[in-house]
Amino acid sequence: IWELKKDVYVVELDWYPDAPGEMVVLTCDTPEEDGITWTLDQSSEVLGSGKTLTIQVKEFGDAGQYTCHKGGEVLSHSLLLLHKKEDGIWSTDILKDQKEPKNKTFLRCEAKNYSGRFTCWWLTTISTDLTFSVKSSRGSSDPQGVTCGAATLSAERVRGDNKEYEYSVECQEDSACPAAEESLPIEVMVDAVHKLKYENYTSSFFIRDIIKPDPPKNLQLKPLKNSRQVEVSWEYPDTWSTPHSYFSLTFCVQVQGKSKREKKDRVFTDKTSATVICRKNASISVRAQDRYYSSSWSEWASVPCS
Amino acid sequence: RAVPGGSSPAWTQCQQLSQKLCTLAWSAHPLVGHMDLREEGDEETTNDVPHIQCGDGCDPQGLRDNSQFCLQRIHQGLIFYEKLLGSDIFTGEPSLLPDSPVGQLHASLLGLSQLLQPEGHHWETQQIPSLSPSQPWQRLLLRFKILRSLQAFVAVAARVFAHGAATLSP
């Protein structure tokens, strides 16, 4: 058993049929010694008396808010949550496996630049009685500070018969050094509580590996005289790290016909312009990637050819 | 070139070669298949290789103030990785494919380090500890980890030279 926060405790249980469970001793936080009784949740049934209460925790029916009273007055509470371990593996019932980039990916994180700011998100099908708490650090043995905000519901989607809820959180490294080469990964820890079930999820990454620039901005076409060619120009996204002479991007320019089956023409360039042939009903798209480190490409910025 | 007087290197040449290094480091990496470096639960290898840290003066301001600190740091790292790529971790069994980019990568590391430190000028004697002997099954993982770290190292070096070529070239 360990304390998650004040008056909230997590009992770790090996979860299998007829498991013996865990013996837990609760102590009433009071100077009083006599006339103390214990109840669980809203029930008025007295579970025991005295300053301590010993219980055998085996299942969710044994978890909940234990309260000690004296003469009708509440003295203190202890909320017990369960953390299940099945076949040596902690349960992951609350969050959905996103399976990208690999199986057992519950948390996904992205950064728009090297400033030390990043966003993580996760999915669940649970809509109520759900709380999340997020902590983060740079390294684990001698951790350096990362400050995370509160997790918020950022999207709702219908997937077949189910509703899916996306939660996200923004974090900022306290003393970020954008130009340095990271040697210790960022660790992100999410505590999830659904009713009386506790689970924790972790992710470990370098900012450089989760970089995904915003799409290029101000994408424009300039037709070239007496030619089917156009000059495409664009700018670095506002959110990208500066100076651009240091934090450089490379770009992919694509000409795509209306039909998905039509051949795509692609050009790669380090410049912020390119000359391409504009076909009728086609569109021109540009995306960006860090020039020197192969992290994710941005989403496409597009304009029609006409 | 970085010479004892602390004059500028050939920024444009260094930029071109460091960008080539980035390309080679990424094309060399798939040869060991897909593994997650941090899944190994072993920070040792990543801690044992050079890193360009915050105080090394490799940020735009530091380069403007005095690029020599950063260039020396990059030089040390290049020599270090060049020695690793020339060791039996990469030359031993299992043999690399004949067309593996590791050979080119090794040569380019040496080439860039020589651009930074031409004949007759020595920043300091480059010391590297004895390498632990490795078995074939260990080498695959070590190659993977070294190449992953090298990708990050050369990315910072390439940014430095690109910025230098754009803003510090005579």
Partner: antibody
Framework: QVQLQESGPGLVKPSQTLSLTCTVS????????VHWIRQPPGKGLEWIGV???????DYNSVLKSRVTMSVDTSKNQFSLKVNSVTAADTAVYYC??????????????WGQGTLVTVSS | EIVMTQSPATLSLSPGERATLSCKPS????????????LAWYQQKPGQAPRLLIY???TRQSGIPARFSGSGSGTDFTLTISSLEPEDFAVYYC?????????FGGGTKAEIK
């Protein structure tokens, strides 16, 4: 928890072979090298040799011709043999581990040591 | 082989005093690439195995009190005990693991004055 335990005869006759075993637990043999170090009574520490995670060995050149190290991974046991012993081989013999990495490591855990006396 | 020279051989001090132990290798233990010094410090009490105090010249092993600190680089290293406790009177060894064979210093005995 991590444990290394040396065992073997406390008395060996001159010219015979000293044989010791180091039984380890609490760590993976794939991740750690195991070393033997000795300390003559009242003197300093002397490194004897190492058996690397891959099974290869390196010995101190002073003792190389007389030393053999081996490992039985199924029993988590390492053995040290020193042949043609003399009174100068009388010492406390320790086994210790270091984490396998690119470069040689430091010894973070040691056995409690076993005293071997060479005497007729 | 790298020769490790420790001084003084014996250090006579009273509890509460500051102890400064020196270790000088015959060649540099600094790897300029990764900026690590491949040197460790050990404490040994009578009848016991050595105990790791400091590794990479200045990193304290977990569980070692903050009064123990390591410093230095290259060919000059120091172990400092800021205020000697009675249990600190022991023999201290430095170890180099830059090249094999691994080699130890001859030791410094810290004794009660």
């Amino acid at each position: 928890q991590v444990q290394l335990q040396e065992s073997g005869p406390g008395l060996v006759k001159p010219s015979q072979t000293l044989s010791l075993t180091c039984t380890v637990s609490g760590f993976s043999l794939i991740s750690y090298n195991v070393h033997w170090i000795r300390q003559p009574p009242g003197k300093g520490l002397e490194w004897i040799g190492v058996i690397w995670t891959g099974g290869s060995t390196d010995y101190n050149s002073v003792l190389k011709s007389r030393v053999t190290m081996s490992v039985d991974t199924s029993k988590n046991q390492f053995s040290l043999k020193v042949n043609s012993v003399t009174a100068a081989d009388t010492a406390v013999y320790y086994c210790a581990r270091d984490k396998y990495g690119l470069f040689p490591g430091y010894f973070d855990y040691w056995g409690q040591g076993t005293l071997v006396t060479v005497s007729s | 082989e790298i020769v490790m020279t420790q001084s003084p051989a014996t250090l006579s001090l009273s509890p509460g005093e500051r102890a400064t132990l020196s270790c000088k290798p015959s060649q540099s233990l600094l790897s300029s690439g990764n900026r690590k010094n491949y040197l460790a410090w050990y404490q040994q009490k009578p009848g016991q195995a050595p105990r790791l105090l400091i590794y990479y010249a200045s990193t304290r092993q977990s569980g070692i009190p903050a009064r123990f600190s390591g410093s230095g680089s290259g060919t000059d290293f120091t172990l400092t005990i800021s205020s000697l406790e009675p249990e600190d009177f022991a023999v201290y060894y430095c170890l180099q693991h830059f090249n094999y064979p691994w080699t130890f210093g001859g030791g410094t005995k810290a004794e009660i004055k």
